[in-house]
């Protein structure tokens, strides 16, 4: 018979022969022959292969370097790599998470729209009319101006996006 030019899924062509690929978590030790199956070996501790493969070496698990602010989010297995994230207060610079960025704070006049996570930064929004923020914070939303009326007071000083209104007593009409 003609030697194959293509092989089935999870097989590879070598020496005019279709051999089985090694399953995830295992590496290739020796190719199959006319008489023997492909020989595979499990990856060692701290190694992985995440696809059907013919690799002779497993990949090292990613190291989450604490000196870069990284920590393990999910421990690797023989079939999956370790997933890193950043320590509290910081987030990954990129999807690869090889370094960390300090969460930004929202300046006075801005409030937190979305609190930062291990993979995304703080999202700030300007305080709309009727709201203010007088602090730089990574957590605080814009606060509504104090309602003087509900306290039976009047506005003595208008609020801004950075300051609350100042309430004062109503002027009593003299008889």
């Amino acid at each position: 018979p003609e030697p194959p030019t293509a092989c089935r899924e999870k097989q590879y062509l070598i020496n005019s022969q279709c051999c089985s690929l090694c399953q995830p978590g295992q590496k290739l030790v020796s190719d199959c022959t006319e008489f023997t199956e492909t020989e595979c070996l499990p990856c060692g501790e701290s190694e992985f292969l995440d696809t059907w493969n013919r690799e002779t070496h497993c990949h090292q698990h990613k190291y989450c370097d604490p000196n870069l602010g990284l920590r393990v989010q999910q421990k690797g297995t023989s079939e999956t790599d370790t997933i890193c994230t950043c320590e509290e207060g910081w987030h990954c610079t990129s999807e690869a998470c090889e370094s960390c960025v300090l969460h930004r704070s929202c300046s006075p006049g801005f409030g937190v729209k979305q609190i930062a996570t291990g993979v995304s930064d703080t999202i700030c929004e300007p305080c709309p009319v009727g709201f203010f923020s007088n602090v730089s914070s990574a957590f605080e939303k814009c606060h509504p101006w104090t309602s003087c009326e509900t306290k039976d007071l009047v506005v003595q000083q208008a609020g801004t996006n950075k300051t609350d209104v100042v309430c004062g007593p109503q002027d009593r009409l003299r008889a």
Epitope: N67, E87, E88, G89, S94, A96
Partner: antibody, heavy 116, light 112 residues
Amino acid sequence: EVQLVQSGAEVKKPGSSVKVSCKASGYTFTSYTMHWVRQAPGQGLEWMGYINPSSDYPNYNQKFKDRVTITADKSTSTAYMELSSLRSEDTAVYYCARWGYSFDYWGQGTTVTVSS
Amino acid sequence: DIVMTQSPLSLPVTPGEPASISCRSSKSLLHSNGNTYLYWYLQKPGQSPQYLIYRMSTLASGVPDRFSGSGSGTDFTLKISRVEAEDVGVYYCMQHLEYPLTFGQGTKLEIK
């Protein structure tokens, strides 16, 4: 080997703008933030802001917020810092620095002189 | 903004003698995650700054072990056990607890 190579010295007139470049090599550009720090003659170090090249997300020191723009070009692994409305007090050496373990790699510095 | 204050501003030292630089922050740099975000840099004459110590006490790669960093939340010390001629330059502390990142004024170490 990680390297940050900055553009050459500039002499600018008050009121004009300057754009300094910082070309990175020897690492994955999008994996680390790039910061800008300046040093006026005989003075200390002053942080201006950074760019995250992965997200193109900048963060500025409020002191410079209305005058500084930090950008990054992923295709050339280059970060840029543009400072506008220049005044004599902006005469300084401007450094780019990568944030990893710390500011672990620095550019050689770009001298910007503002003079009429 | 967090204010970083260094002392002394000038430090003449005899080679072989110890040296100590103090840095004080206006706010504790100890984060709730347990890390202290205080960094030390050295700027040698005519050069860009280089990092010496990160997170208060960890020595950067290639930095001689005669350097050490210590401190609490607001008071920090950089020590050189035996000063050598190559240690001359300006030493800066910096906080990275919050933006804007701020540096101390610098301490100029010179050889007597």
